[in-house]
């Protein structure tokens, strides 16, 4: 089944054609494409009304459409793999001919949540109801169909063809017939606007006589944005009718001579154009020659005009259109400048915030300020950044180097710090002894206690291994600590001598202990320095590395 009957409506700079025929969306798009168009867009209420008009025209010609609820493809589609997006007016759909998403939509019902299948949109027409401008066709979403299987209730499609401009319809001053042939291969005798490059064939006469004259015209661009047939005077004029037939084909006034001849004229404030038929305002601004937000300003004596642009815009080379001024060329900002339509805005680098003297100035963010420090312990503010540091007994950790992790001194690289038992605590450690031994005053060695339970096989033999003082330890600390007062686990003992005598049992202890209140408050030099943001967004390469690498998402890992 091909595309059969068609209707056409031309308005503004576009023509819409409606076709009946049970085609898939791809076949319908192909049909529009072959003639230089696309399936129609419906980007505004006004455009929806144009499309509705062309559909109404088609339905008047089509005697009996098969379904009460008929659907006509338009150019709104969602490709395979693109998900429904409820946050957007077009829900993740886009117009096949490209172009920007617009806020107008007219969905029939909540859309099916899918990503895998390609989905296409049709206009849903209830043929039992009259088509009213107030009741515009709803958008219905569904599968796009396939050759021979267009989808349920698909009765046709609507194409859209865009043009540089339009010519006015030719005016006949006497009996005759005009046939327009458009660039998209449609023929029509009644168009309210005729697209650029259309041909007009005019056959003058009553139709039943031999004296029929034929004229052929082409809609051309006479000057920029001025489209004209190149004809002069009314067509098919007849002394028999004078001004009585179709106002002599004149746009405004028709003046008859005594011999049956006549001339066209214009009302005050208007002038007759070269075609000797059409009238145009003497005010050159009345034809809205300025584009893109430009305002038309009349010259002296109303003879000519200039276009003026709003602030932040300037005239382009045509002197008719406004283009954005790139204010960032003048470097008005201290750090980053972002050009916006009609203006600009200043932004600050990561680690800075707007402020300081002058427009567009930036000042350092004090990341270490009270209540906003990202560091677990120590924080030092730097220009555009900061770096974290940890207390004695902790090292910097975490992917962004803001956390502090306890150093397990009992398994440190220098070997055990205690002669016998070693208890790691949060931020510190302390030593202990086996049953029957007591801790020496140096807090590291063990000496024989008052009650002997049998000496360990390898008694302590070195005086002082402690590189830092452990926290206060009760004398004769045993190797089997139970739980702390709040039920928190105490430290895990680590023995530095593996061979213990059989009569000196060691019971297992729970894991880790919260840092004792008496932990030393000494600052340790940071192992990661947060590079300043001024040199570009950076982040540490690893937990204990001081190498900064470019972050692939362009954000600063520390901010």
């Amino acid at each position: 089944t091909g595309a059969d009957t068609e209707a056409v409506v031309c308005v503004g700079t576009a023509c819409y054609t409606a076709h009946s025929g049970k085609l898939s969306a791809a076949e319908a798009q192909n049909h529009c494409n072959q003639n230089g168009g696309n399936l129609a867009t419906v980007k505004s209420k006004e455009e929806a009304q144009h499309v509705q008009r062309v559909l109404a025209q088609l339905l008047r010609r089509e005697a009996a459409l098969t379904a009460r609820m008929s659907k006509f493809w338009i150019g709104l589609q969602r490709e395979k793999g693109k998900c429904l997006d409820p946050s957007l007016p077009l829900k993740g759909f886009s117009w096949v001919g490209g172009g920007e998403d617009t806020p107008y939509s007219n969905w029939h019902k909540e859309l099916r949540n899918s990503c895998i299948s390609k989905r296409c949109v049709s206009l849903l027409l209830d043929l039992s109801q009259p088509l009213l401008p107030s009741r515009l066709p709803k958008w219905s979403e569904g599968p796009c169909g396939s050759p021979g299987s267009p989808g349920s209730n698909i009765e046709g499609f609507v194409c859209k063809f865009s043009f540089k401009g339009m010519c006015r319809p030719l005016a006949l001053g006497g009996p005759g017939q005009v046939t327009y042939t458009t660039p998209f291969q449609t023929t029509s005798s009644s168009l309210e606007a005729v697209p650029f490059a259309s041909a007009a064939n005019v056959a003058c006469g009553e139709g039943d006589k031999d004296e029929t004259q034929s004229h052929y015209f082409l809609c051309k661009e006479k000057a920029p944005d001025v489209f004209d047939w190149g004809s002069s005077g009314p067509l098919c004029v007849s002394p028999k009718y004078g001004c009585n037939f179709n106002n002599g084909g004149c746009h405004q006034d028709c003046f008859e001579g005594g011999d049956g001849s006549f001339l066209c004229g214009c009302r005050p404030g208007f002038r007759l154009l070269d075609d000797l038929v059409t009238c145009a305002s003497r005010n050159p601004c009345s034809s809205s020659p300025c584009r893109g937000g430009a305002t038309c300003v009349l010259g002296p004596h109303g003879k000519n005009y200039t276009c003026r642009c709003p602030q932040g815009y300037q005239l382009d080379s045509s002197q008719l259109d406004c283009v954005d001024v790139d204010e960032c060329q003048d470097s008005p900002c201290a750090q980053e400048c972002v050009n916006t339509p009609g203006g600009f805005r200043c932004e600050c680098w990561v680690g800075y915030e707007p402020g300081g003297p002058g427009e567009g100035a930036c000042q350092d963010v004090d990341e270490c300020a009270l209540g906003r420090s990202p560091c677990a312990q120590g924080c030092t503010n730097t220009d555009g950044s900061f770096h974290c540091s940890c207390e004695e007994g902790y090292v910097l950790a975490g992917e962004d180097g803001t956390q502090c992790q306890d150093v397990d001194e009992c398994v440190g690289p220098g070997g055990p710090l205690c002669d016998s038992l070693c208890f790691n605590t949060q931020g510190s450690f302390h030593c202990g002894c086996l049953p029957g031994w007591v801790l020496a005053p140096n807090g590291v060695s063990c000496t024989m206690g008052p009650v002997s339970l049998g000496p360990p096989s390898g008694p302590p033999d070195e005086e002082d291994k402690g590189e830092k003082e452990g926290s206060t330890v009760p004398r004769a600390a045993t190797a089997s600590p139970t739980r702390g007062p709040e039920g928190t686990p105490k430290a895990t003992p680590t023995t530095s001598r593996p061979s213990l005598s059989s009569d000196a049992p060691i019971t297992s202890a729970p894991l880790k202990m919260l840092a004792p209140s008496g932990s030393p408050g000494v600052w340790r030099e940071p192992s990661i320095h947060h590079a300043t943001a001024a040199s570009g967004p950076q982040e540490p390469a690893g937990g204990d590395s001081s190498v900064a690498t470019q972050n692939n998402d362009g954000t600063d890992g520390q901010k």
Partner: antibody, heavy 120, light 108 residues
Framework: QVQLQQSGADLVRPGASVKLSCKAS????????MHWVKQTPVYGLEWIGG????????AYNQNFKGKATLTADKSSSAAYMELRSLTSEDSAVYYC?????????????WGQGTSVTVSS | ENVLTQSPAIMSASPGEKVTMTCRAS???????LHWYQQKSGASPKLWIY???NLAFGVPARFSGSGSGTSYSLTISSVEAEDAATYYC?????????FGSGTKLEIK
Amino acid sequence: QVQLQQSGADLVRPGASVKLSCKASGYTFTDYEMHWVKQTPVYGLEWIGGIDPETGDTAYNQNFKGKATLTADKSSSAAYMELRSLTSEDSAVYYCTNYGNLYYYAMDYWGQGTSVTVSS
Amino acid sequence: ENVLTQSPAIMSASPGEKVTMTCRASSSVSSSYLHWYQQKSGASPKLWIYSTSNLAFGVPARFSGSGSGTSYSLTISSVEAEDAATYYCQQYSGYPLTFGSGTKLEIK
């Protein structure tokens, strides 16, 4: 409420095929896509592919093309995944899942999983 | 394909602690298409956070999610024993959908 009921555990020989089923209830079957996910201790969760029951359209992870075939039966509201030429690498738990109430591929419904063991 | 890297692979925390796990993508992901799942041993995964920061039905308010571009994170403000599980991130930026390797959270 939405439920996805998967077939029971399977022990299959190397080189054989197996067809797993996922029966949906509590919603209109053709309204939601159905996806399949493989889980192993080594590779964790891997998306195999999905099917749109309304149209029969499918999308596959290239790593599983030729290994898995997804189908759906509207009349019984069930989705199927056939795995062929099985090897020990295919031993895994397979889940059917869909995103009924949410958008952007946030899988809010999961079956209980089917354990497939490939062993001679 | 867009590879998701989760870190750390395993983490342990005491009840009441604040924990953060991260998910990095090899290429940018729209925040709408980044989700987190919780899976407990022997159970199916459960959607936990969707579209970066929205909590799924029934998820406690102590959980939160944030991020954009290639870097995302899940945070638990005050860990509870019931939070012990493996957490997976998942993204979609074109087929195939991919999951992270998971972060196993153990409670001390």
